[in-house]
């Protein structure tokens, strides 16, 4: 694989949002031959899925640049190597009165489709993003966020819900995916791995990132989440990958510094309001989008996923704090709280930018394998 090359005039350089130094791409294998990340503990394979070599226990392959920029997801290398079997981290499951199949977990039984049949649906999340197969859609305009810069008061509830750390957001955070596609932010939560093991939910060319943030939104067409579940576009999630960088991320520190207070499952604390948009990448114009599902039971479909191309940088210490502080069910550490990537089953991921175009001198002509389905919208 080629060495990373620096792009000094990168429009995404600067700021604390991440790296944007493009990596060289090799010829990509076909989708059928693409390596798939190892299933995380806790979810049985859906019918037809194979156990393929994983990459969780391999050292991460990514450039270490002293200059700030943003990693271009579409140019990440594919890691192909046999992975050691991953030991479930959350394999203790306490027996309690009233315990039933709805008490799902990442560590094993019950199989998620038994908890909710929708988890065996055909259009599930997360997925592996293959930029070369993404459809460039010029109609996908920059995301619009309004009211995300919150004042310190009122304070917000930060809770360890046993599956993640969740920040409940107040009314008034408005987000638009485009004209007539308006949403209200409800909450945000994170997914992570364990020491030396990445834990993002989505992957790019099989590459799993250290962590991932999800900001969950409800369409303004609905008053309540239960009304929107399973309805196309009823829910929308903004997702961004978290990566290791040289500096502490001050926005994230406002949350990470409080995790010790909510180490126990079910515990919560109040944190001052903060700039929620500062937790996301700064470039709202470059992203991938597809229709999928909630990544936890009940796995309801119809969720619009928007995955930022730009990543967010946290220090190594911050990523360690995230993955090594909280406790989940059964007195087990809350780690590796990500679902296995799910088959696209014919879905085409759209991109707001020409992600599949190889900009290297090697390419005689741009390569774009899928056309935009939303042209003219």
């Amino acid at each position: 694989q080629r060495l990373p090359r620096m792009q000094e005039d990168s429009p995404l350089g600067g700021g604390s949002s991440g790296e944007d130094d493009p990596l060289g791409e090799e010829d990509l294998p076909s989708e059928e031959d693409s390596p798939r990340e190892e299933d995380p503990p806790g979810e049985e394979d859906l019918p037809g899925e194979e156990d393929l070599p994983g990459e969780e226990d391999l050292p991460e392959v990514k450039p270490k640049s002293e200059e700030e920029g943003s990693l271009k997801l579409e140019d990440l290398p594919t890691v192909e190597a046999p992975g050691d079997p991953q030991e479930p981290q959350n394999n203790a499951h306490r027996d309690k009165e009233g315990d039933d199949q709805s008490h799902w977990r990442y560590g094993g039984d019950p199989p998620w489709p038994r908890v909710s049949p929708a988890c065996a649906g055909r259009f599930q999340s997360p997925v592996d993003i293959r930029p070369q197969l993404a459809a460039f859609c010029p109609a996908l305009r920059p995301l619009e966020l309004l009211g995300f810069q919150l004042p310190p008061l009122p304070e917000l509830r930060l809770r360890n819900n046993g599956h993640s750390v969740q920040l409940t957001l107040p009314p008034g955070l408005e987000m638009a995916l485009g004209p007539g596609r308006e949403y209200r932010a409800l909450q945000l939560h994170l997914h992570w791995g364990a020491a030396g093991r990445p834990g993002s939910e989505h992957t790019v060319e099989g590459h799993r990132f250290p962590a991932e943030i999800h900001v969950v939104h409800l369409s303004t067409a609905f008053a309540r989440v239960d009304e929107a579940l399973g309805r196309p576009g009823g829910l929308a999630v903004l997702a961004a990958f978290l990566e290791e960088g040289p500096e502490e991320n001050s926005a994230y520190e406002q949350l990470l510094s409080r995790l010790e207070e909510i180490a126990e499952e079910g515990s919560e604390t109040q944190v001052p309001g903060l700039d929620i948009s500062a937790l996301l990448p700064s470039d709202f114009s470059r992203y991938f989008q597809y229709e999928g599902s909630l990544t936890t039971p009940p796995c309801a479909q119809g969720v619009i996923w928007t995955v930022f191309n730009q990543t967010v940088m946290l220090s190594a210490k911050q990523l360690h704090t995230l993955s090594d502080t909280l406790w989940g069910p059964g007195d087990s550490r809350l780690q590796l709280n990500f679902r296995a990537t799910q088959p696209l089953n014919g879905r085409v991921i759209e991109a707001s930018f020409p992600a599949g175009v190889d900009s290297s001198p090697r390419a005689a002509e741009p390569v774009q394998l899928n056309s935009c389905l939303a042209a003219g919208d």
Partner: nanobody, 117 residues
Framework: QVQLVESGGGLVQPGGSLRLSCSAS???????????MAWYRQAPGKGLELVAV???????QYSSSVKGRFTISRDNSKKTLYLQMNSLRAEDTAVYYC????????WGQGTQVTVSS
């Protein structure tokens, strides 16, 4: 449309017991099993106070003022949340609210608990 309905409140003497129930109706039934459930209370002239939480996996947390006296539990098959309150004190007098946290907060209308001799 009522989503969460509390019951079981009433007048009780100090040292007595009550069991509160919170039943999910309508669309809230669909998300009950996946929600973190909680009891909050509001005493006269005071703010909302978290009493107890139970996660979807059954993990529980209690405020220091009720720990050892109150027990939160849930029956997902019945879509019902419970709060067993023992050794009640005058300072437990409040309106008790049921809360479901599933991407957004769902609230009940509240049930009055009065502890008085």
């Amino acid at each position: 449309q009522v989503q969460l309905v509390e019951s079981g409140g009433g007048l009780v003497q100090p040292g007595g017991s009550l069991r509160l129930s919170c039943s999910a109706s309508g669309g809230a039934r669909n998300i009950f099993s996946f929600a973190a459930m909680a009891w909050y209370r509001q005493a006269p002239g005071k703010g909302l106070e978290l009493v107890a939480v139970i996660t979807s996996a059954g993990g529980t947390q209690y405020s220091s003022s009720v720990k050892g006296r109150f027990t939160i539990s849930r029956d997902n098959s019945k879509k019902t949340l419970y709060l067993q309150m023992n050794s009640l004190r005058a300072e437990d007098t409040a309106v008790y609210y049921c809360n479901a946290d599933y991407y957004q907060d769902y609230w009940g209308q509240g049930t009055q608990v009065t502890v008085s001799s």
